[in-house]
Interface confidence: medium
Amino acid sequence: KSPIFGPEEVNSVEGNSVSITCYYPPTSVNRHTRKYWCRQGARGGCITLISSEGYVSSKYAGRANLTNFPENGTFVVNIAQLSQDDSGRYKCGLGINSRGLSFDVSLEVSQGPGLLNDTKVYTVDLGRTVTINCPFKTENAQKRKSLYKQIGLYPVLVIDSSGYVNPNYTGRIRLDIQGTGQLLFSVVINQLRLSDAGQYLCQAGDDSNSNKKNADLQVLKPEPELVYEDLRGSVTFHCALGPEVANVAKFLCRQSSGENCDVVVNTLGKRAPAFEGRILLNPQDKDGSFSVVITGLRKEDAGRYLCGAHSDGQLQEGSPIQAWQLFVNEESTIPRSPTVVKGVAGSSVAVLCPYNRKESKSIKYWCLWEGAQNGRCPLLVDSEGWVKAQYEGRLSLLEEPGNGTFTVILNQLTSRDAGFYWCLTNGDTLWRTTVEIKIIEGEPNLKVPGNVTAVLGETLKVPCHFPCKFSSYEKYWCKWNNTGCQALPSQDEGPSKAFVNCDENSRLVSLTLNLVTRADEGWYWCGVKQGHFYGETAAVYVAVEERKAAGSRDVSLAKADAAPDEKVLDSGFREIENKAIQDPRLFAEEKAVADTRDQADGSRASVDSGSSEEQGGSSRHHHHHH
């Protein structure tokens, strides 16, 4: 499919001008290659009319130009003094005319309306309001006022001052007679429809002395604004419908076959399933404007979108609307990353988030999409060392591996962690990607004790059992804090006996804390990694208490204080069940608060939007650089 994009249809009137914008992927080659505008012949072929290399056909001499905007990835063709002869099929493109790097454009030039003398022209957008002013003389001040519409050869009464309203205009038209000082009446038509366009006649009086005024009403269908975005990127539709519809329900819909427009999202709470987890409708401003953000763009998202206002929250005749034609460029600069990441309850996930590598210094964020109230995304963690309180000890954002990718690790997974998450930066806002975390059945691979208590001044040894499947991975222990997870020395104690059917390649790696101090209290992670790519992690909370009896503590899986949410296995090892381990020092009320996520709408329909990849999670060795 050609990555070139432009307007499918351009309509104008004889004598007027048009400006046609064509988009291309702004690669170095594309920016500098030839741009052209050609007319398609009946037998194929395309005859160049103007190009960026200076060529201008005699047909366009003195009335057309082509300007390239390499920094935007666009070029613009301006054509003036249009005639009906200019109607036809054209291409805008790059390189050689026949190469296929082009987009088809249909140009329709119509004759201007043949208007009667003294005709006032009203040009109004679809769905808006028009006021037709009708002057009259004093002798007709007390006589009937009326507005007719010319249908074919006959004038049809639309409204009059005796109270008649044509059924086609019911509920959206009124006739106002100005105060005695002004010899003027006006007809106001709301929620204009395309069918309202045409010639009108207003009249004061019914005899040969009546005053008449001709009006020509042109109702404009909004020209779609062209929007060119990368596959996997995001788009924002800014919809400004005006203050008169500030209190009317708003919607964004996508045109399907014919005149159908399927609601994508509206302010009445409707949201299309295909956009679950990747759409936000921003609150409307006092002037009735609002915006819709869609992330994780797919090929099938391309098409014509309309935003509008109607009490039903969907497109109806007479809705004021704005239109966009979205083109999704498949030659995307945004790298592929898994759209679904699966994690086992009690274990972890490591999510890779792409960002624009030119913006390595930008702040990175991760947020949880919530479906409530038209979608929102509370931030959970950022690269400046902030972590939402409920996620302390189990969430970390790493700048690694860098060069266009950062990593987010979430461990101690529970079923409540299932949902959609957004990767964000404060740089190029088009780089917003979405990942769905699914919680699946299974056992965590890494085995660690539950919460551990260390004694001040003594030595603590905490084991982490790695199955043989991780034999080729680097194994580590680290201490979690808001800015990451700082690497700690650890000892390989040889093969682990924690796994059935696992050979000598399994490993027991211990963390040793010598001469424990209060500062040693906190969360510790053990994990695996390969280079800068992180695998599974497991978390242990170490509490510190006063000395009771001398000696050092060597915590085995079986020995650690059994908590209500843990069970001792026959093999003598204890396994942590599917619960997030909270700081044991929290009071019961605080624990409840820390364990309750901001209430989302509860409905989290899973949408597999692409590649699915099972992943583990982990932590980091390096501090953030602020």
Partner: nanobody, 124 residues
Framework: EVQLVESGGGLVQAGGSLRLSCAAS????????MGWFRQAPGKEREFVAR????????DYADSVKGRFTTSRDNAKNTVYLQMNGLKPEDTAVYYC?????????????????WGQGTLVTVSS
């Protein structure tokens, strides 16, 4: 956590104007939804205005619509409340608040960071 400090309050005559500023420190607020609230003596704290992360979407209490305007300068990590046509009933302590929500609707309970407030007194 972000720290917010309001300034610009004071005594003004009815019909006058004031511009309140809210300077944030501790972290960048360019993905925060920011809000203004006020509390008159003996009354509950009430919502005044909010502005989304980009500054493109604002929202106001009915009592201040058309008179108050909120804006933000993300480069300066600062949010503003321009108050025109002040009335005696606007007298209150004005608070700036931040919510770590990326876009979308934000309810009052979502504002987690608060300033100490600045007093605005409107005399008749």
């Amino acid at each position: 956590e972000v720290q917010l400090v309001e300034s610009g309050g004071g005594l003004v005559q009815a019909g006058g104007s004031l511009r309140l500023s809210c300077a944030a420190s501790g972290r960048t607020i360019n993905t925060y939804v920011m809000g203004w609230f006020r509390q008159a003596p003996g009354k509950e704290r009430e919502f005044v205005a909010r502005i989304d992360w980009s500054g493109s979407s604002t929202d106001y209490a009915d009592s201040v619509k058309g008179r108050f305007t909120t804006s933000r300068d993300n480069a300066k990590n600062t949010v503003y409340l321009q108050m025109n046509g002040l009335k005696p009933e606007d007298t209150a302590v004005y608070y700036c608040a931040g919510s770590a929500y990326y876009s979308g609707y934000v309810t009052h309970r979502d504002f987690g960071s608060w300033g100490q407030g600045t007093l605005v007194t409107v005399s008749s």
